[in-house]
Interface confidence: low
Amino acid sequence: VPDKTVRWCAVSEHEATKCQSFRDHMKSVIPSDGPSVACVKKASYLDCIRAIAANEADAVTLDAGLVYDAYLAPNNLKPVVAEFYGSKEDPQTFYYAVAVVKKDSGFQMNQLRGKKSCHTGLGRSAGWNIPIGLLYCDLPEPRKPLEKAVANFFSGSCAPCADGTDFPQLCQLCPGCGCSTLNQYFGYSGAFKCLKDGAGDVAFVKHSTIFENLANKADRDQYELLCLDNTRKPVDEYKDCHLAQVPSHTVVARSMGGKEDLIWELLNQAQEHFGKDKSKEFQLFSSPHGKDLLFKDSAHGFLKVPPRMDAKMYLGYEYVTAIRNLREGTCPEAPTDECKPVKWCALSHHERLKCDEWSVNSVGKIECVSAETTEDCIAKIMNGEADAMSLDGGFVYIAGKCGLVPVLAENYNKSDNCEDTPEAGYFAIAVVKKSASDLTWDNLKGKKSCHTAVGRTAGWNIPMGLLYNKINHCRFDEFFSEGCAPGSKKDSSLCKLCMGSGLNLCEPNNKEGYYGYTGAFRCLVEKGDVAFVKHQTVPQNTGGKNPDPWAKNLNEKDYELLCLDGTRKPVEEYANCHLARAPNHAVVTRKDKEACVHKILRQQQHLFGSNVTDCSGNFCLFRSETKDLLFRDDTVCLAKLHDRNTYEKYLGEEYVKAVGNLRKCSTSSLLEACTFRRP
């Protein structure tokens, strides 16, 4: 019988008492085969973290800073359940740390040196750790003691709880530096008052502070937020302009064998029986013998943290950067106006080889990082392990939802000023063999399908989106008799046609022979009835243009396109017979790397782009002989996006809507994780 006990870690007598009450009340409402609670008492949160790592306890609820400690080796804990605040309809699991300024003050984030600062309190998250952590490498050396470096950075501050004797500048704006509400500039409201009164130029608070202190919109309009990209935004645009997004209070468990499903089952049942306004005898979110015991008193309930989410993703790149800077105290040697090498994310073995070659040729401008799937690459870019990669539109959507931005677009047509003119897009088509003359768009049920990969534009999002509108369900593996859609569940019929061997079968990378445009077309040639690809795929792989044994004798005339009106047309008539227009592939990166990725890639394409005439003796960025490694092989150049610099603007309203509709059918664990951070 599996052990269904969750050992909760308590850090005080009062917590232990509440834990025992929790245990006893759960016993009274949960059947004997359900989850149960046991209580383990430790002296501190850090002791609890160590106990969970050592399998002496299973769960504890932590503030964000401690979630970071819990994640670090050798603890390796992960977030499993989040407390939420506000309503069930609009649950808030995060708050945003922001820098508020007066509208007419005219300076940006990178011009804070010499300004006067208002902090909620020394060592507090939004008011100190995050802003000072992010500014850490701009502080004058020596950076230790930190208070002295901060005092020398700003021209005056109010940082309640600081030592006013040793660091008088930190108390200059609030005589005494008192560490309670007796100090009028203490806490969130106090720091904002410090700004409002004109004592300081910037207040480091959380996003809700300004709304809690100024009910009137006209008054709020006198203030702005400083953004990390050195712009300003109105105070209600905090989701797009903040220093960090911080989880409020989170249950953590072991990453391996951590009982995360059991913990969720327990807490989900607990909130049903003892949540807000549920029971008189025992209340989960109330602490009669103290404050915030086991859980925050202000919490309204729990949400399950998506399994794909590790602590780094949960805490977010900015928060992790700030805390790491403070803890490790290391700053890069290079001057900050110089671009560091761009870490390119390469998918599996084949892309890695090409990337390594690029890296050597780039003389230190490009470095390579490997991942096995596109989603793993996106996650690495999010957390700073990698910086950039080129993505199909379907993944540009997921990357955008995860906070990444498009920076350059692949262009596929030769033109005089290629780099200045991003194209409208390519065509997503459905290809069949000419010999299968009875096959149309309207009778695909039961046929064998070939897809570039799950989540990609031409191979999945467009055809399956259209199909979904017709069949109104997501069981595509039942609609087609079998197929190859790399990235599907291994036991799905949509992996049956795939050709990868062993663990590589149906993997969404080049280890699966039927992956990508060329792979999907090969699948059609060898096994399938229909392939969902781009309009250039057939001509690129017929007429001897692809020397592979399976392709060398193929003839374009032996294939036709399926049109949405039920007719068929020759391959060259794609403009009048396609499923939809697809946005070109685009390079994505984090917002903080946007300028450098843009600059370095423009240099790289001038060295190794389409202007290289002989690819047999030289490195060519846009060539991999039909394998589309790192970039599509038909890329002519990488083009500027001009104002299409967000994923919504880049992909266009129509495509975003189409992918949004298909979200019901999404198997993307990363998309689920990212929409948890930003619904």
Epitope: H350, E357, P549, S616, E625, T626, K627
Partner: nanobody
Amino acid sequence: QVKLEESGGGLVQPGGSLRLSCAASGNVFTIDAMGWYRQAPGKEREVVVGMTNGGKTNYADSVKGRFTISRDNAKNTVSLQMNSLKPEDTAVYYCYARSKLIATINNPYDYWGQGTQVTVSS
């Protein structure tokens, strides 16, 4: 297919020298570049140096001035002369060849040998 066979690894003291050789056989007419990459335990693979048929070379910064690649196109061999070796050069060294005829996914266009261990230690 192209088959690659390395020789010449071994144990050497810091500051010492080693020469690695690699012989290519099979579809050698398809090769348009050869070189070496290395992998140290628990580290990412790193390209050490590559050389095209035309003689263009690219060295990793960490080995510049210490390692020299040479190729004999007639004999289809590539050699790596490693001087002033350091403990951080310890790794398995793989010879690789790049093909201008891109074959199928299961027959990759880059080929590599079994690897030869180089250990720099006193």
